[in-house]
Interface confidence: medium
Amino acid sequence: KSPVFGPQEVSSVEGNSVSIKCYYPPTSVNRHTRKYWCRKGASGRCITLVSSEGYVSSNYAGRANLTNFPENGTFVVNIAQLSRDDSGHYKCGLGINSRGLSFDVSLEVSQGPELPNGTEVYTVDVGRTVTIKCPFKTENAPKTKALYKKIGQTSVLVIDSRNYVNPNYKDRIRLRIPGTGQLIFTVVIDRLRLSDHGLYLCQAGDGSNRDEKNADLQVLEPEPELVYEDLRGSVTFHCALGLEVANVAKFLCRVNSRETCDVVINTLGKRDSAFEGRILLNPQDKDGSFSVVITGLRKEDEGRYLCGAHSDGQLQEGWPIQAWQLFVNEESTIPRSPTVVKGVAGGSVAVLCPYNPKESQSLKYWCLWEGAQNGRCPLLVESQGLVQEQYEGRLSLLQEPGNGTFTVILNQLTTQDAGFYWCLTNGDTRWRTTVEIKIIEGEPNLKVPGNVTAVLGETLNIPCHFPCKFSSYEKYWCKWSNTGCQTLPSQDEGPSEAFVNCDENSRLVSLTLNPVTRADEGWYWCGVKQGHFYGETAAVYVAVEEKKVAGSRYVSPAKADAAPDEKVLDSGVREIENKAIQDPRLFAEEKVVADTGDQAGGSRASVDSSSSEEQGGSSK
């Protein structure tokens, strides 16, 4: 399908002008290629009428032009002094007329209505309000005032000053007679319907002395605003319906093939399941305006959207509406990224978030979509490192891999973490994307002890076990903080051939803190990655305590919680049986070692891979 998009139907009146805007993907080639407006003939050929290269056909000379806006990916065709002969089928396009990079536009030019002299013309959108002004002479001031609608040769009474109201206008019309001295009465019609369209007659008094004034009321369906967005991107519909409906329920609906309108979302809590997790109805302002954001755009989201107000939260005739025609461009600049990421309870996920690569300095955010209250998205983390309290130690936003993608890591997963999350920046809002996290059955691949208590001044060693499938990955330990996860210095991870063969003695990466200081308290992550692409992580909290007074019964210098069976050894080293480990098949025994002896040289914090003293067993 062609990525060029424009208005399907354009209608106007003889003598008037039209402005036709066509959209195209703003690639470098497209921005500079020829743009054209041509008319389709009976033969199927399309004859150029105006182009961006300066050509204007004789028929269009002096009344048409084409302007390209390459920075927006749009071009505009203006045609003036329209005649009925301009009605027909046209194409706006790029390149060569026959190439197919075009959009079909139907132009209909109708004859203007023949109106009686002195007729006042009122042009109002459907659902809005019109005030018809009716002047009269002093002698008719005390006499009956009325408004009639002309239907063919007859006049039908709509409203008069004797309290008559035509049933078709019930509860939406009023006649106002001013105080003395003002020789004008007004008729106000609210919530205009298409059927209200037509010629009206104001009358004051009767007989030959009566005052009359003609009014032509043109009720228009709102011209849909064309919206051109990229596949996988985001769209915002800003809906401003006016103060008169500020306190009425609002909705966004999509027109279906039967020309009815299916509610997408409304302020009464209704939401189309097709938009679950990727829509927000932003709370309305006091002037009644609101906006709807849809992310993760799909081709099937294309179509005509209406926003409106009605107490039922759905489209009703005679209530104000706004319209959009959404086109989803499949030649998207937004890269594909997983829309569903799966993790296991206790495990982790690494989510890749795209952003506009031209905006590398923009702030990045991640928020959790909430379905309540028309959809809300509280921010959980942002690129300056700030993390919401309840996510401390288990959530980090990393600028890597960069160049249009950032990474969000969430670990210590629980079933509560399942849901939809949005990737955001404070830059180009069209790059908002949605990812769903699903929690599935299984065990985490990385195994670390539970929370660990370390003793000031001593050595702490924390093991992290990984399965064979991660043997080719880079392993790391990092210390989590609000500003990210600072990688700790890494030591040689053992002979490379051991990793290649997945030697069972090489499936452990250990963190050593020597000596332990107060500043070491906090969250540590063990993780795997390939280049700048992050894989699984596991988190452990290290608490730091003072050394106990000599002679007292021993308290482990490096104590891991949730170890049901432990032997207290005279050497001051506590052994944790495999019951503390989530997958006993992965390794038989784990030691959290507090080494009271001095270590010669070496870094204070180090990561090292060594034997896990496995008794066999295989990883999943």
Epitope: T236, H238, L280, N282, P283, Q284, D285, S289, F290, S291, V293, S362, L363, Y365, C367, R376, C377, P378, L379, V381, E382, L386, V387, Q388, E389, W422, L424, N426, G427
Partner: nanobody, 124 residues
């Protein structure tokens, strides 16, 4: 949590100007959107202005449009409200509030963090 401290209030004559400041400390992610609200004696607290983190999206109450300007300095974690052409009806306690909700329009209910307020009195 985030702490918000307002300053800059005071007594000013009608037609005069004041600049209010709101300094945030702590978990400033909760000031992704920062707003100013005001409460006059015996009246409900009402929205005055709001600004998002980037400063690119601002919104004002009709009663202050063209007179008040909201801005922010992220390096200082501070949001400002410049109030010009002050009127007696602007007299109120002005509160700064923060929200972590990503939203095009943020209403009163979306603000979870509030300051203690600063008194602004405009005499005629």
């Amino acid at each position: 949590e985030v702490q918000l401290v307002e300053s800059g209030g005071g007594l000013v004559q009608a037609g005069g100007s004041l600049r209010l400041s709101c300094a945030a400390s702590g978990r400033t992610i909760n000031t992704y959107v920062t707003g100013w609200f005001r409460q006059a004696p015996g009246k409900e607290r009402e929205f005055v202005a709001r600004i998002d983190w980037s400063g690119s999206s601002t919104d004002y109450a009709d009663s202050v449009k063209g007179r008040f300007t909201i801005s922010r300095d992220n390096a200082k974690n501070t949001v400002y409200l410049q109030m010009n052409s002050l009127k007696p009806e602007d007299t109120a306690v002005y509160y700064c509030a923060g929200s972590a909700y990503y939203s095009g329009y943020v209403t009163h209910r979306d603000f979870g963090s509030w300051g203690q307020g600063t008194q602004v009195t405009v005499s005629s």
